[in-house]
């Protein structure tokens, strides 16, 4: 405050994603993702922290398992209030198969399409989210390799619920979802012990994305 | 909208062989775990099996194992229920229901958020 | 396999009472992966409750679901004429899906 008592300047709160953003989430929608409201719980939580707009962060979510359905694209919604409706009303799309390169591959080929919304110039943030190894992990090197080549930043969420449900080893999967994450793997890649707790790493991730643009 | 649409009641004598339906809709069927649960006549609730219409991997319950046999035909979206020969202790409803959760790799957990109308089923 | 026991039996309650329908499992329910199902005459069950807590879609929110381990409980909050029904518990936390005997909910 200056003598005049006018507001010279201020410092925004780091709560709010205002920068400019070109983020596609892509989910693990398989049967074995349960409760799939943890899923839209943790959307909801993560989207209404971001300032989305044409001008400011635009959101995109891709939905894979034995294939790959786009919820919708980057430019579909103007704002962060028409997201979170949209978000809450995505459901489970089922099957066995986690075909998560296949999912990948999907987000970086069209949902990062100046088609569907994509801005030129404007950084893209991929985060994936799944809860068990790929069926279609022969083709991960190469997906993650492109997505590199496209300056694509990744976060990847590894759940670990099914894993501990059935009481497996959870080394491989915790590995291969580190392989997708970019470097350095410790900013970008989350363990969570089940679906439940997907939102306690809400205000990390979105700490983590909004970083990208400072 | 999903829907699970069953076949309609059936009168059978003891000896009998009988195949019951349940014909998913408003979702991908061959992507959702379907289980059959048993009413007997002013009692509860029974599980007697599920099965995943994508590649027919069926789980039964104990209780139910080669008492019945469940299966499926993916390309017509329906879960089946049959006897080979029906006893007067199988008079019951029967219900199918969409399994929300999973059934793979020995551990099966989910609650069931869509059910058929019922079938009932009287064998004397 | 898990073995569930609810009570009462039976309950008698007016419209606007709240009614309090007990399930206790015979073992720990892993993950509080218990459901609560309402069946009306004549009807297939409708899901009201999974996780123990949450509601199923288009479920009002007179109903509520608590506990965890061996001991669950459906609270509704101001009984409605609908609600007078055979309320199930189910647990499904042991590759099986076992259900209680049922609470009926009758007008007094």
């Known amino acids: 405050v200056s003598p005049t008592f006018q507001v010279v300047n201020s410092i925004a709160p780091v709560q709010e994603c205002s920068t400019q953003l070109d983020i596609v989430i892509v989910l693990d929608g398989s049967n074995s993702i349960y409760p799939w409201d943890s899923v839209t719980a943790f959307l909801n939580d993560l989207l209404e922290r971001m300032d989305i707009g044409p001008k400011q962060t635009q959101v995109g979510i891709v939905q894979y398992g034995e294939n790959v359905t786009h919820e919708f694209n980057l430019n579909k919604y103007s704002s962060t209030e028409e997201v979170l409706v949209a978000a809450k009303k995505i459901v489970q799309r089922g099957g066995r198969q986690t075909m998560t390169a296949l999912g990948i591959d999907t987000a970086r080929k069209e949902a990062f399409t100046e088609a569907r919304g994509a801005r030129r110039g404007v950084k893209k943030v991929m985060v994936i989210v799944t809860d068990g190894e790929s069926h279609d992990n022969h083709r991960l090197k190469k997906v993650i390799q492109d997505c590199e080549d496209e300056n694509i930043q990744r976060f990847s969420i590894a759940i670990l619920g099914s894993y501990n449900r059935g009481n497996l080893s959870t080394e491989k999967f915790v590995e291969e979802i580190k392989s997708i994450a970019s470097e350095p793997t410790e900013k970008h890649f989350f363990n969570v012990s089940d679906e439940l707790a997907l939102v306690t790493i809400v205000k990390a991730l979105g700490e983590r994305i909004f970083a990208l643009e400072a | 909208e999903v829907q699970l649409v069953q076949s309609g009641a059936e009168v059978k004598k003891p000896g009998e062989s009988l195949r019951i339906s349940c014909k998913g809709s408003?979702?991908?069927?061959?992507?959702?775990?379907i289980g059959w649960v048993r009413q007997m006549p002013g009692k509860g609730l029974e599980w007697m099996g599920i099965?995943?219409?994508?590649?027919?991997?069926?789980r039964y319950s104990p209780s139910f194992q080669g008492q019945v046999t469940i299966s499926a035909d993916k390309s017509i979206s329906t879960a089946y229920l049959q006897w080979s020969s029906l006893k007067a202790s199988d008079t019951a409803m029967y219900y199918c229901?969409?399994?929300?959760?999973?059934?793979?790799?020995?551990?099966?957990?989910?609650?069931?958020?869509?059910w058929g109308q019922g079938t009932l089923v009287t064998v004397s | 396999e898990i073995v569930l026991t609810q009570s009462p039996g039976t309950l008698s309650l007016s419209p606007g009472e709240r009614a309090t329908l007990s399930c206790r499992a015979s073992q720990s329910v892993s993950s509080s992966y218990l459901a609560w199902y309402q069946q009306k005459p004549a009807q297939a069950p409708r899901l009201l409750i999974y996780?123990?807590?949450r509601r199923a879609t288009g479920i009002p929110d007179r109903f509520s679901g608590s506990g965890s381990g061996t001991d669950f409980t459906l609270t509704i909050s101001r009984l409605e004429p609908e609600d007078f029904a055979v309320y199930y518990c189910?647990?499904?936390?042991?590759?099986?899906?076992?259900f209680g005997q049922g609470t009926t909910v009758e007008i007094k």
């Open positions: 189910q647990q499904y936390g042991t590759s099986s899906w076992t």
């Open positions: 996780v123990a807590s």
């Open positions: 229901a969409r399994l929300q959760g999973d059934c793979s790799g020995g551990t099966c957990y989910g609650h069931f958020d869509y």
């Open positions: 099965i995943y219409p994508g590649d027919s991997d069926t």
């Open positions: 408003g979702y991908s069927v061959t992507s959702y775990w």
